[in-house]
């Protein structure tokens, strides 16, 4: 059983954006790194949005391999036991602790790379992810809060006399929604439980000079805008029109 | 503070149609969705579907698309709820519930209306 | 339509006693949100995305999990949680809102 289709579902046009799979990392390069580490800073943490469906690659703070003694990283996940994942260097194991995703993976053998990759993000990547480092000189660490995006389906449609409805779908997180004019406008958002949400936005035009109205998203996986011609007469057909 | 206001029970003669109401207050009722739950006695809750009181869309649960109809009068901010050709079935508490707002799911309900269907 | 299934339908336990019950989801959900009706009441929100309390929710209580299986926990139960709790969740494609059947929580 699904739900029926709203029943005023005049589409004129959908906008989507698609994003071939890309990789995304804050890693710092070889150059960096610096034996002054622990002077400069001891932790860092880092919000880093990554859009869903990439690759992404977490670093550890900048320490020589060769002065490490353990590398942890840890991974906490909304609703799940924290996830560890450790290798020490004198005996050359790795060990991991309640981890169950196949997809956060070291990215090569840890005595050459401490970095951890996430293949084809999902939105249940969202969370906190720290790399700590034991060395002779102390700890070091690193965090980020990683914030899974995802691109919201952009629809603009007329529903009635001088009214028109603007919908961001499916996007995370929220998207913001503005009309060029301003109109007399209602915007209500909704959550869904695959971790996106959808807004929409309905306005009303009672000054009748006004005959092409512009809904803008703005998100931060970019954005958009698409504009409509308002007809006197409710379900006549006109294509919005994407900026 | 946000109140959704309904009547405590109805009483409905099987093959007839009732309407129930829900009155808002404490917000906008433009700014989020109208929802509508039945609970059957000693049942689970069933959501029937919901309208948006800004343009009236509406979405059902495919289940109650021929059963119920759902409508709204701003002026008054009540939305209201039209069930046809009761039937013994149809014996439960209807609850409007209110959504689209910063958290997920319904977090504002009203206190059910209790429709009994009976010659 | 995901389909919600909660068990146990029926559990009691006695005060200061861990409580926990759990919900499958047939198909997977990012998150879940969980309801409580005492009887003759409306439901009120308990837990949502999973594991935060709604306003007024006391501490002893603790959404977990992921994909197809969540669970609520009340670490030490008390008088005042005897109700029913309905795990939740909805999609938009297509749009539809479930609640899971119920597990009704006594105390002994």
């Known amino acids: 059983e699904g739900a029926a289709q709203p029943n005023n579902s005049l589409m004129l046009q959908t906008s989507k954006e698609n994003h071939a799979l890309a990789s995304s990392s804050l890693c710092m390069d070889e150059k960096q790194i610096t034996q002054n580490y622990s002077k400069v800073l001891a932790e860092v943490n880092t919000s880093w949005p990554v859009k869903m469906a990439t690759n992404a690659v977490l670093c550890c703070p900048p320490i020589a391999l060769r002065n490490l003694i353990i590398i942890t990283w840890e991974i906490i996940l909304r609703g799940q036991p924290s996830c560890t994942k450790a290798y020490k260097k004198e005996t050359n194991e790795t060990k991991e602790t309640n981890c169950t995703d196949e997809r956060i993976t070291w990215v090569s053998r840890p005595d050459q790379n401490s970095d951890l990759q996430i293949r084809t993000v999902a939105i249940t990547h969202d969370g906190y992810y720290r790399c700590i480092m034991v060395t002779p000189d102390g700890n070091f660490h690193r965090g980020y809060h990683l914030q899974v995006l995802v691109t919201p389906e952009v629809t603009l449609f007329q529903n009635r006399n001088r009214t028109a409805v603007c919908k961001a779908v499916a996007g995370k997180p929220a998207a913001h929604i503005s009309w060029i004019p301003e109109g007399d406008c209602a915007t209500k958002q909704e959550y869904w439980s695959n971790g996106t949400v959808t807004v929409k936005s309905t306005c009303h035009w009672e000054v009748h000079n006004v005959s092409t109205v512009t809904c803008h998203v703005s998100h931060l996986t970019g954005n958009k805008s698409l504009y409509i011609e308002l007809l006197p007469v409710p379900g006549a057909k006109k294509s919005a029109k994407l900026y | 503070q946000v109140q959704l206001q309904q009547p405590g029970a109805e009483l409905v003669k099987p093959g007839a149609p009732v309407k129930l109401s829900c009155k808002a207050s404490g917000f906008t009722l433009t700014s989020y969705w109208m929802n509508w739950v039945k609970q059957r006695p000693g049942r689970g809750l069933e959501w029937i579907g919901r309208i948006d009181p800004s343009d009236s869309e509406t979405h059902y649960n495919q289940k109650f698309k021929d059963k119920a109809t759902l409508t709204v009068d701003k002026s008054s901010s009540t939305a209201y709820i039209q069930l046809t050709s009761l039937t013994s079935e149809d014996s439960a508490v209807y609850y409007c519930?209110?959504?689209?707002?910063?958290?997920?799911?319904?977090?504002?309900w009203g206190q059910g209306t209790l429709v009994t269907v009976s010659a | 339509e995901n389909v919600l299934t909660q068990s146990p339908a029926i559990m009691s336990a006695s005060p200061g006693e861990k409580v926990t019950m759990t919900c499958s989801a047939r198909s997977s959900v990012s998150y879940m949100h969980w309801y409580q009706q005492k009887s003759r009441t409306s439901p009120k929100l308990w837990i949502y995305?999973?594991?935060k309390l709604a306003s007024g929710v006391p501490g002893r209580f603790s959404g977990s999990g992921s994909g197809n299986s969540y669970s609520l926990t009340i670490s030490s139960m008390e008088a005042e949680d005897v109700a029913t709790y309905y795990c939740f969740q909805g999609s938009g494609d297509p749009l539809m809102y479930t609640f899971g059947g119920g597990t009704k929580l006594e105390i002994k």
């Open positions: 995305d999973t594991s």
């Open positions: 519930a209110r959504s689209g707002g910063w958290l997920p799911g319904f977090a504002y």
